[in-house]
């Protein structure tokens, strides 16, 4: 089967894993979001928009 990480979906140097539940990103320090697309601000807040119901940062997207 195709490697879901082949397209490098995790931004800003995040690591992609092909978990059986769906691809998973582990973000580099300083970034967050399901695809590591959002910077973490120095004060600890982030530019992360409100997550859809039931979806937490880091959860797989099928």
């Amino acid at each position: 089967r195709a490697d879901p990480c082949a397209a490098r979906p995790c931004a800003h140097g995040g690591r992609c894993y092909a978990h059986f539940s769906g691809l998973v990103c582990a973000c580099a320090p300083g970034y967050m979001g399901a695809r590591c697309e959002f910077p973490v601000h120095p004060d600890g807040a982030s530019a992360l928009p409100a997550a859809p119901p039931g979806l937490r940062p880091g959860d797989p997207q099928r």
Partner: antibody, heavy 118, light 109 residues
Framework: QEQLVESGGGLVQPEGSLTLTCTAS?????????MCWVRQAPGKGPEWIAC???????TDYASWAKGRFTVSKASSTTVTLQMTSLAVADTATYFC???????????WGPGTLVTVSS | QVLTQTPSPVSAAVGGTVTISCQST????????LSWYQQKPGQPPKVLIY???NLEIGVPSRFKGSGSGTQFTLTISGAQCDDAATYYC??????????FGGGTEVVVK
């Protein structure tokens, strides 16, 4: 069936060196994993040593392991752990383990025993 | 990163409930990248729970994980003799760092 098998353990003298090999079967490192080494001294808990991310070859080490331990990918199915300046305290069973997401080790090898003694 | 577990040993009767706690000195990645393992002598650890509360495939439903951030719990409901083992928590942290707890021995009588 996905499997990991460690080899290369044995008796080594203090200040000696040893290279352990982890061989994967049933899968290859063409997919992205953290291939890691974990050790467990007799009667103690597991202790993380190092990982190599097969996606780009980057490596990460426990703070205490930097400098004496080197993890590398030898082929599409083998990972090695080079250990130098070994001490009696390094006596342990060394396990190879795989993280395929969420930071946990879902696949382990049976381990190889390293004994450091004069 | 240090993970501190319930002191050993923890004893339970067959059919009883076992609760093991795991506290981290800092929040794990994503607040829930914490896993639990069972280990028996001569064997490698076997994962029971990943991402704090997800049951690994093939693991009996009497094992339940909960918690987030720095405080986590493993509960065994209806303990069986086969559950006698040492249990370890393991966290994953920002910066691609792993750490294990010291372990909790569970005795089932």
């Amino acid at each position: 069936q996905e499997q990991l098998v460690e080899s290369g353990g044995g008796l080594v003298q203090p200040e000696g060196s040893l290279t352990l090999t982890c061989t994967a079967s049933g899968f290859s490192f063409s997919s992205s994993y953290d291939m890691c080494w974990v050790r467990q001294a007799p009667g103690k808990g597991p202790e993380w040593i190092a990982c190599i991310y097969t996606g780009d070859g980057s490596t990460d080490y426990a703070s205490w392991a930097k400098g004496r331990f080197t993890v590398s990918k030898a082929s599409s199915t083998t990972v090695t752990l080079q250990m130098t300046s070994l001490a009696v305290a390094d006596t342990a069973t060394y396990f190879c383990a795989r993280n395929s997401g969420y930071g946990y080790f879902g696949l382990w090898g049976p381990g190889t025993l390293v004994t450091v003694s004069s | 990163q240090v993970l501190t577990q319930t002191p050993s040993p923890v004893s339970a009767a067959v059919g009883g409930t076992v609760t093991i706690s795991c506290q981290s000195t800092e929040s794990v990645y994503g607040s829930d990248w914490l896993s639990w393992y069972q280990q028996k002598p001569g064997q490698p650890p076997k994962v029971l729970i990943y991402q704090a509360s997800n049951l690994e495939i093939g693991v009996p439903s009497r094992f339940k994980g909960s918690g987030s951030g720095t405080q986590f719990t493993l509960t065994i409901s209806g303990a069986q003799c086969d559950d006698a083992a040492t249990y370890y928590c393991q966290g994953y942290y920002s910066g691609y760092i792993y750490a294990f707890g010291g372990g909790t021995e569970v005795v089932v009588k």
